[in-house]
Amino acid sequence: AMHVAQPAVVLASSRGIASFVCEYASPGKATEVRVTVLRQADSQVTEVCAATYMMGNELTFLDDSICTGTSSGNQVNLTIQGLRAMDTGLYICKVELMYPPPYYLGIGNGTQIYVIDPEPCPDSD
Amino acid sequence: AMHVAQPAVVLASSRGIASFVCEYASPGKATEVRVTVLRQADSQVTEVCAATYMMGNELTFLDDSICTGTSSGNQVNLTIQGLRAMDTGLYICKVELMYPPPYYLGIGNGTQIYVIDPEPCPDSD
């Protein structure tokens, strides 16, 4: 399996934005790469977002995705937004080298993202 | 050494308040107990606050302390307030059984407290 590295812990900003780098040890020069972010909480795993990109191009997530990202070589800079305290959990980076063959798969150990809901601002009178 | 348990991770609220339980496996019923909170960051250890209490009584920290607490049996419920993002670090609970003899000492593995500074509220016009 391909090695994927990601930070152990990230704190979301008070605006609910968390960013982290997902780095994969590519065994060759892939031209087409797929990155998927999975969330694991209470032993449940759900897909947060996914993007397929051509090396050298931008990552393109779906329009309604809570993720954005950029790539540079074997590194993908991922940003997840709109996070609330209830979204605290382990976010796992999954990388697939889709083309050319052979297919490679790598799964990181996960990044624990902690989210704290902000206090509401006082009403302006 | 006496065993001391504390949670691995705690998130401070957006108001900069963090609470955690420090539990010690007492060899019996001490009548006088001292609890100290130490902060470890960048290999530096500093004392955050300390209180000596008689079993069954409230913990009394100094008036200007950032800590408050309550005790119940072999558990101490600690609250640290006024935390800022720069205060993120490992907070270690140290428990000493002062009386009756012999003296017992226990030091926990530390609680990583994460603090995120809130976004300022917009000015009210």
């Epitope: - | 007492s26 060899p27 019996g28 001490a30 009756p100």
Partner: antibody, heavy 118, light 107 residues
């Protein structure tokens, strides 16, 4: 490493006083802890008798209180049990043991068997 | 006095199997419960204190749980040397009291 060793007569006549001593090595009995007597009748469970504290304080099991005296000799680093007016029901293995105040027993003597019989 | 009642009085378990001994206190004793192992001709030996903490040198197959009035000693995989009588002990309140003992044998 603290060590406790009981000693005393193995046979006591009914109505007499049972006297046992526990010699402690490796720790001064006046420095800390509470120094206890516990007994175990043949084939039965454990019964706590009482303690003498590092400070000379005493506490006895209410069920035996009227017949018990626990004392100490700090110069010899030992403590003793006297149980008066014994009957056959006091036949038991008698252990000395150490604990923190109202705590578990972390060190025990090997025990000494006392038989009450005429 | 606080009465500590153990169940069962005796227990036969196969080698490698799990053994569970229960202890019920007549009133709340918090977590102030210890467990001892006693082999013939020997004094009791401390296994567990504060309900769930293993004493120094005690194998990790021994574990304790519970709080309040109900407590359990578990031996995860019975070994031949575990054959003994086991006692629970409350040290919440004087006079200190023990359970009546549970005799553990190999099936």
């Amino acid at each position: 490493q603290v060590q406790l060793q009981e000693s005393g007569p193995g046979l006591v006549k009914p109505s007499q006083t049972l006297s046992l001593t526990c010699a402690v090595s490796g720790y001064s009995i006046s420095s800390g802890y509470y120094w206890n007597w516990i007994r175990q009748p043949p084939g039965k469970g454990l019964e706590w008798i009482g303690y003498i504290g590092y400070d000379g304080s005493n506490y006895y099991n209410p069920s035996l209180k009227s017949r018990i005296t626990i004392s100490r000799d700090t110069s010899k680093n030992q403590f003793s049990l006297k149980l008066s007016s014994v009957t056959a029901v006091d036949t038991a293995v008698y252990y000395c043991a150490r604990n923190y105040y109202s705590g578990y027993f972390d060190s025990w003597g090997q025990g000494t068997t006392v038989t009450v019989s005429s | 006095d606080i009465v500590m009642t153990q169940s069962p009085d005796s227990l036969a378990v196969s080698l490698g199997e799990r053994a569970t001994i229960n202890c019920k206190a007549s009133q709340n004793v918090g977590t102030y419960v210890a467990w001892y192992q006693q082999k013939p001709g020997q004094p009791p030996k401390l296994l567990i204190y504060s309900t769930s903490y293993r004493y120094s040198g005690v194998p990790d197959r021994f574990s304790g749980s519970g709080s309040g009035t109900d407590f359990t000693l578990t031996i995860s995989s019975l070994q031949a040397e575990d054959v003994a009588v086991y006692y629970c002990h409350q040290y919440d309140t004087y006079p200190l009291t023990f359970g009546q003992g549970t005799k553990l044998e190999i099936k």
